[in-house]
């Protein structure tokens, strides 16, 4: 004959454990039911009633199933410099990620708390290390021969073109112009461009407990501004 | 273009129900609530209460909690606030608002408001 | 309930003149669940700043807003015609959800 189906809350065999989405409640000392994603515990369960569960109350979540008594809090509306990549749901926390051309500046243990925006090299220099989601470019120098005439975060320094005849020297920052006869190049012309860094990693706001237990606050820290490192600019 | 378009002005009787209507366009987020405030002549606002439209659920003041009754008809995109028992003190603007789900309460939309007149 | 108690009730500011105005709540309230809205004679209420310090598109950059806790404020760094109105604070925080009395913002 087939075991008999326990209904929750039922008390689990000396040992075992209660089943899937299921939790034992110590208080009752039973085996009682979970309350699912978008929902939370409005009333334990007893001896002789199972768990009441109640849906999340408006920007609070719980993403697993659960027996909290109160849903966690979303976190903050995306700032300007990010984008809302998820809204926040009764099943799931908002996500902000960087916008391009932002990179992550102040991590936390879950996503970013502080999106900057990426530095951008100056005539004369060019990008020797591209940003990243979480971290910045760096600038450096163009070396004899190569030259950047842009601000840009993309742009690494290009060979000159090389002239049968100069009629203006290149330097860090500028060409080299040639007469009228035809130039050539040590490389493929034009401009080499680096991609910009894609955002995917998920950058969750905080869960913080909902506000009738224990108020969140906003997790966008004002952050003064640094001076630019050499060869970038603040713009 | 976001819309919340609201029932005309009413003058109703002493102990009277009056059913105010709210009908939502533009809106493309199905995760909102519709909430109603009161407006007494030269007074300040006054939140009714709030009706989840997918589920029905509401929430109300518990001073409104007899006086007030919410519903809403997703298929016409419409919340609803009925007031019985009316008495001078209803005379009052009726505003119904809408605010998305996780944006914290902040009401972003208000419809041009509802005046209803209590008076035999 | 939490009571929301916004000082002045009535004031009035000159052109140019920096504006400052308060909501205290009777007891705690989460910053992101603290709105404040704009309401001109005969209009509907609009939501001027939300969570606290965030303005909604539209709502010109010299108003700010900041507080945390029960204190709140709503700022105008230098008042203009159109900033005549009364404004209201609205705590989302926990239920019922509470209005402030308003403060009504004219011109001297």
């Known amino acids: 004959l087939p075991a008999q189906v326990a209904f929750t809350p039922y008390a689990p065999e000396p040992g075992g454990t209660c089943r899937l989405r299921e939790y034992y409640d110590q208080t009752a000392q039973m085996c009682c039911s979970k309350c699912p994603p978008g929902q939370h515990a409005k009333v334990f369960c007893t001896k002789t009633s199972d768990t009441v569960c109640d849906s999340c109350e408006d920007s609070t979540y719980t993403q697993l199933w659960n027996w909290v008594p109160e849903c966690l809090s979303c976190g903050s509306r995306c700032s300007s410099d990010q984008v809302e990549t998820q809204a926040c749901t009764r099943e799931q926390n908002r996500i902000c990620t960087c916008r391009p051309g932002w990179y992550c500046a102040l991590s936390k243990q879950e996503g970013c708390r502080l999106c900057a925006q990426l530095r951008k090299c100056r005539p004369g220099f060019g990008v020797a290390r591209p940003g990243t989601e979480t971290s910045d470019v760096v600038c450096k120098p163009c070396a004899p021969g190569t030259f950047s005439n842009t601000t840009s975060s993309t742009d690494i320094c290009r060979p000159h073109q090389i002239c049968h005849v100069v009629a203006i020297p290149g330097n860090a920052s500028m060409d080299a112009v040639c007469t009228s006869t035809s130039p050539t190049r040590s490389m493929a012309p034009g401009a080499v461009h680096l991609p910009q860094p894609v955002s995917t990693r998920s950058q969750h706001t905080q869960p913080t407990p909902a506000p009738s237990t224990a108020p969140g606050t906003s997790f966008l820290l004002p952050v003064g501004p640094s001076p630019p490192a050499e060869g970038s600019t603040g713009d | 273009e976001v819309q919340l378009q609201e029932s005309g002005p009413e003058i109703v009787k002493p102990g009277a129900s009056v059913k105010l209507s709210c009908t939502a366009s533009g809106f493309n987020n199905k995760d909102i609530y519709m909430h109603w405030v009161k407006q007494r002549p030269e007074q300040g606002l006054e939140w009714i209460g709030r009706?989840?439209?997918?589920?029905?659920?509401?929430k109300h003041d518990p001073k409104f909690q007899d006086k007030a009754t919410l519903s809403s008809d997703t298929s016409s995109n419409t919340a609803y606030l009925q007031f019985s028992s009316l008495t001078s003190e209803d005379t009052a603007v009726y505003y119904c608002?809408?605010?998305?789900?996780?944006?914290?309460?902040?009401?972003?939309?208000w419809g041009q408001g509802t005046t209803v007149t209590v008076s035999s | 309930d939490i009571q929301m108690t916004q000082s002045p009730a009535i004031m009035s500011a000159s052109l140019g003149e920096r504006v400052t105005m308060t909501c205290t709540a009777s007891s705690s309230v989460s910053s992101n669940y603290l709105h404040w809205y704009q309401q001109k004679p005969g209009s509907s209420p609009k939501l001027w700043i939300y969570s606290t310090s965030n303005l909604p598109s539209g709502v010109p950059a010299r108003f700010s807003g900041s507080g945390s806790g029960t204190s709140y404020s709503l700022t105008i760094s230098s008042m203009e015609a159109e900033d005549a109105a009364t404004y209201y604070c609205?705590?989302?925080?926990?239920?019922?959800?509470?209005f402030g009395g308003g403060t009504k913002l004219e011109i001297k």
């Open positions: 609205h705590q989302y925080h926990r239920s019922p959800w509470t």
């Open positions: 608002a809408h605010s998305p789900y996780g944006d914290f309460g902040a009401m972003d939309y």
């Open positions: 009706i989840d439209p997918a589920t029905g659920n509401t």
